[in-house]
């Protein structure tokens, strides 16, 4: 069961796995949640009654029964991991800790104007886990305004001490705020021979890459496939680092694959969620339970529902045996990965889906789309919303995209003449406008946030956020789309679609069924040639066919230009403006969302 509240002056007895240092009980709970085995924790706050060397200790604990005896202890704060909870979880921690020095390896020291600048520096440095900044009031003159970037093996401080006039905080890489490049390529027949920080077993290079991504010290990896000549090293995943942050040694070697941590793009790809099944593969590990199950899917469900289960192997039933049920082996290990992987024994293996909630909802696979045709089908674009105005009469005003459970991203120009959010209604999960009746449920709009540099669509900054009055419950027909990662600026998207209920030609009417059109992106240079009277800036992105014929049009404004990359849909553009509709050599112009990611995060994550 999910217990979120913290227990003051309470200590859990026994069950210790390891001790780390965290600046708060709240962050201790996050660390426990992300640890492969931790189910409960006890944090020690600063207190005159406690030995200062025990301040800020976060003891991670495990228990077969999922609970432990409680003991009263002043300054102790205990609680449970969020593994038992169904809500979305994030490791993002923007808190700044005043008068705390978080100890680690100080590998970089420089002058910074503010703690915020120091935090940004940490976020954009590949090695940095956390920082300490000496403020201008710091007693020692030569240390004032010094920004110390730090890292440790675990990603958490090795100790935390009280120190006047300093502030500390964590890298915001896990908040999608890093400008570091996101290199998604996996290099076949390549070994990176740099330092290994750890090794685990993985069924394929993709899982190895995801493990590297959420390992605090891993910058790149090498994976030995099941065809690797050395039997004892098959399925071995080597987690690696280097001083420069890049592999210094690339060696050509057949049956090995190498790649990079996806830390800088983890908000737009699944990192924790290993949802595939591995056929004719057995995962070895500590056995938690053996249960009868009808299929490997049922076995995965059982593993997901058992909080301590990390992975499983299912052995199908031998003909007509046990009512056609096979054996489902629920397993765990110290690091969440199998201790060994065997092939050719007939098992079907996989991982718990419990950790999927640690990934952004937007990375969830949606149902296959219908190819061809211009009318969409239900659930094809679950992030698309129709924004209605009720004044003077109710009508479709603009499109928009769900980007969070309380947030819609749309175009600023949609709100020309809109005096108040009270007249707006957001409908999600809609295919046909005719579905919208008096009693159709909608989301009220609490606030319209228009970019403060917006003047008119053609001059850019055509972007706005709608904060909804209530939260969206994600389903197959209404769920968010991923924002592009800042590290993905150089990605060339080839599978882009514009959707909306807008006109199908210049003089037309709003369409009943949500329309879709596949449209190629056009370079900004090419686009500028087509719009000599306008300035096409890097904050705009263009799409269209040279010969015209397919484009967004009136009524599509604010809607998404959605591009699929690595099986995940990204909101690359917001329909903004263009000369006419679908005219020859007049591409549509869209707000280039990647250039506004900071603005979006600043507005949506504001406390």
């Amino acid at each position: 069961e999910c217990v979120t509240q913290l227990l003051k002056d309470t200590c859990f007895e026994g069950g210790d796995i390891t001790t780390v240092f965290t600046p708060s009980a709240k962050y201790c709970q996050v660390v426990c949640t992300y640890h492969p085995r931790c189910l409960l924790f006890t944090f020690t706050a600063e207190s005159p009654s406690e030995d200062p060397t025990r301040w800020f200790t976060c003891v991670l604990k495990d228990s077969v029964t999922e609970t432990l005896p409680r003991v009263n202890r002043t300054a102790a704060i205990s609680g449970y991991s969020f593994k038992q909870c169904s809500h979305q979880i994030s490791a993002c921690n923007k808190d700044i800790y005043v008068d705390l020095d978080m100890k680690g390896i100080n590998y970089n020291s420089s002058v910074a104007k503010s703690a915020q600048e120091c935090q940004e520096r940490c976020t954009d440095d590949v090695h940095c886990h956390f920082f300490t900044y000496a403020t201008r009031q710091f007693p020692s003159l030569e240390h004032r305004n010094i920004c110390l970037l730090k890292h440790t093996q675990t990603g958490t401080p090795t100790r935390i001490t009280k120190l006047d006039k300093v502030v500390s905080g964590f890298s915001l890489k896990s908040c999608a705020l890093s400008n570091l490049a996101c290199i998604r390529d996996i290099f076949p027949n390549t070994v990176f021979a740099d330092s290994n920080i750890d090794s685990v077993m993985a069924p394929d290079a993709f899982v190895c890459g995801r493990i590297c991504t959420h390992h605090p010290g891993c910058l790149f990896f090498t994976f030995f496939s099941q065809e690797w000549p050395k039997e004892s090293q098959r399925n071995l995943c080597l987690l690696k680092t280097s001083e420069s942050g890049l592999p210094s040694t690339r060696i050509k070697k057949s049956k090995a694959l190498s790649g990079f941590s996806l830390q800088s793009c983890r908000h737009s790809i699944p990192v924790f969620c290993h949802s595939s099944f591995y056929h004719d593969t057995d995962f070895l590990g500590e056995e938690l339970d053996i249960v009868a199950a009808k299929s490997h899917e049922a076995c995965q469900k059982l593993c997901t529902n058992a909080v301590r289960c990390q992975f499983f192997t299912y052995t199908p039933a031998q003909a007509s045996c046990n009512e056609g049920k096979g054996k489902c082996y629920l397993k765990l290990s110290s690091n969440g990965s199998p201790t060994k992987i065997l092939h050719g024994r007939g098992g079907i293996s996989g991982y718990t889906l419990r950790l999927c909630k640690m990934d952004n909802e937007c990375t969830t696979k949606i149902k296959p789309r219908i190819v061809g045709g211009t009318a969409s089908v239900r659930g094809e674009w679950p992030w698309q919303v129709t924004l209605h105005t009720t004044s003077p009469t109710q009508r479709h005003l603009c499109g928009g995209s769900i980007i969070g459970n309380q947030w819609i991203l749309t175009a600023a120009h949609c709100f020309y003449g809109v005096e108040s959010p009270k007249i707006l209604r957001v409908y999600s999960g809609i295919l046909n406008q005719s579905e919208i009746k008096e009693d159709t449920s909608f989301f009220g709009v609490q606030e319209i946030i228009i970019h403060d540099q917006y003047k008119m669509a053609e001059s850019g900054y055509d972007i706005a956020l709608l904060k909804l009055e209530t939260t969206v419950n994600y389903t197959d027909s209404q769920r968010p789309i991923c924002l592009p990662s800042k590290g993905d600026r150089n990605v060339i998207y080839t599978d882009c679609w514009v959707t909306g209920w807008g006109y199908r030609k210049l003089r037309d009417k709003i369409q009943n069924t949500l329309q879709k059109a596949k449209i190629p992106l056009v370079t900004n240079e090419e686009c500028q040639k087509r719009y000599r009277g306008h300035k096409i800036t890097h904050k705009m992105i263009c799409a269209g066919y040279r010969e015209g014929g397919k484009d967004a049009c009136k009524g599509d404004s604010g809607g998404p230009l959605s591009c699929k990359h690595n099986e995940v849909w990204h909101l690359v553009g917001i329909t903004s403006w263009g000369e006419g509709c679908a005219q020859r050599e007049r591409p549509g112009v869209y707000t280039n969302v990647v250039e506004y990611v900071d603005w979006i995060l600043e507005k949506t994550q504001a406390v």
Epitope: T222, K230, Q233, T249
Partner: nanobody, 126 residues
Framework: QVQLVESGGGSVQAGGSLRLSCTAS????????MAWYRQAPGNECELVST???????YYADSVKGRFTISRDNSKNTMYLQMNSLRAEDTAVYYC????????????????????WGQGTLVTVSS
């Protein structure tokens, strides 16, 4: 018990040469990717050169053109011919089998299927 035994280390003047050998026992040498690593006092373990099972070679930039790696599968032995030695080549040289990268910066800890020798000291005086 897999064994890797290095020999050939010693003291030499700058500009001089040495030839290191590594003899392997108790595993199939021909199928293994072999390497030389080195660790100078106070420094991390660094890869010097690799020779794969199919004869492919790799050299660190700092030794390119001066060092040559080779192997004789019939003798279960790998060699490192070191010419034009410099003071900065002073280190303990380790022979390794199927070890792709050092672990936590030192030349002794390995992952499954990887092996290290005990090391041989090379001292280059200027």
């Amino acid at each position: 018990q897999v064994q890797l035994v290095e020999s050939g280390g010693g003291s030499v003047q700058a500009g001089g040469s040495l030839r290191l050998s590594c003899t392997a026992s108790e595993f199939t040498f021909d199928d293994s990717d072999m390497a030389w690593y080195r660790q100078a006092p106070g420094n991390e373990c660094e890869l010097v050169s690799t020779i794969t099972s199919d004869g492919g070679t790799y050299y660190a930039d700092s030794v390119k053109g001066r060092f040559t790696i080779s192997r004789d599968n019939s003798k279960n032995t790998m060699y490192l011919q070191m010419n034009s030695l410099r003071a900065e080549d002073t280190a303990v040289y380790y022979c390794a089998a199927d070890q792709w990268g050092s672990a936590e910066g030192d030349c002794t800890s390995s992952y499954p299927g990887g092996y290290w020798g005990q090391g041989t000291l090379v001292t280059v005086s200027s």
